[in-house]
Amino acid sequence: EVEKTACPSGKKAREIDESLIFYKKWELEACVDAALLATQMDRVNAIPFTYEQLDVLKHKLDELYPQGYPESVIQHLGYLFLKMSPEDIRKWNVTSLETLKALLEVNKGHEMSPQVATLIDRFVKGRGQLDKDTLDTLTAFYPGYLCSLSPEELSSVPPSSIWAVRPQDLDTCDPRQLDVLYPKARLAFQNMNGSEYFVKIQSFLGGAPTEDLKALSQQNVSMDLATFMKLRTDAVLPLTVAEVQKLLGPHVEGLKAEERHRPVRDWILRQRQDDLDTLGLGLQGGIPNGYLVLDLSMQEALS
């Protein structure tokens, strides 16, 4: 068989169009000029190439840009992006939010792939911080994005970006992540009035210290049980019965249903039974009357 390397007569591609879907792989390799492909990348996404054909097109671009594709090509990759490996993407320098959006759109509706994770990492590192527009974009495509970051990575989120965060974006965050995000949220929302402030800060309270919970208890916030159950146990333990009652308002009755679960269970063990009885909820397990409570942690700190 003749070695099929030369482009057959009359088949040299003058533009990237639908006729190319009829080309065999070797014909694409031989008849499509890589520079033409690069300048007409925006047309590729409109053409229903097979995966095998896309492999050929990718190979041509790889040969043309061995050090990594320029952003003008990256922005128009379309579904050819799905053919890229994390190693390919690490060679890129993506600075435009429009480019990021275009590529995230290709992967829309799917789990975050290693390619997308690498792309986001490259983009954020290039910007130096996770600014509001970027965060807006990323959480729109991947609501769980914020909670996929390590506490160290979250530390680069400026407080101004916190305005872009929706409650559902924090659903899968663990306490370590909320510990980092809470102070930023507190700073971001500091100029809001009481009730508005609570609505905004509520999702972040899993990172709040005791003194902030005490302050909130003085503001008639009526925290719901779902939020209370997400609070740090160490932050809840020092709260008095009166403070928890003020913090929860009418929701205090929900403590009974949660008395076997943390942090309620641990908090009950720290309260005087007399004080718990004042709630009239039948909470059991408090410290019996007449017992002296020694705070060993305080004693250790003093010695």
């Epitope: 169009d17 639908e18 006729s19 925006d42 047309r43 590729v44 996404n45 409109a46 053409i47 229903p48 128009h76 379309g78």
Partner: nanobody, 117 residues
Framework: QVQLGESGGGLVQAGGSLRLSCAAS????????MIWHRQAPGKQREPVAS???????NYGDSVKGRFTVSRDIVKNTMYLQMNSLKPEDTAVYYC???????????WGQGTQVTVSS
């Protein structure tokens, strides 16, 4: 958005003919192309014929000389005249629309063509 609807499929004897239609509705812009594809059970999808907004046509090797693609620009409809049908032409036939201005493609739901021997 562009919606595509295929029609005209059915059961036909080998050697017979069928005419498929693909109607496009919605935001139709030039330049564009409309393409017929087919997928037989257990096989990969393959392009059958295409026609663009300038009227240029292309055909897959297996249908050249037997199938003819045409287009009514006013009705935004593409046709596939299939003559001398063979059992190996049995497949689901899909049409797709390539919008080069927006860099997007749209697909129809497909129509079944069965050629009995």
């Amino acid at each position: 958005q562009v919606q595509l609807g295929e029609s005209g499929g059915g059961l036909v004897q080998a050697g017979g003919s069928l005419r498929l239609s693909c109607a496009a509705s919605g935001s139709i812009f030039s330049p564009n192309a409309m393409i017929w594809h087919r997928q037989a059970p257990g096989k990969q999808r393959e392009p059958v014929a295409s026609i663009n907004s300038s009227g240029s046509t292309n055909y897959g090797d297996s249908v050249k000389g037997r199938f003819t693609v045409s287009r009514d620009i006013v009705k935004n409809t593409m046709y596939l005249q299939m003559n001398s049908l063979k059992p190996e032409d049995t497949a689901v036939y899909y049409c797709s629309y390539s919008d080069f201005r927006r860099g997007t493609q749209y697909w129809g739901q497909g129509t079944q063509v069965t050629v009995s021997s």
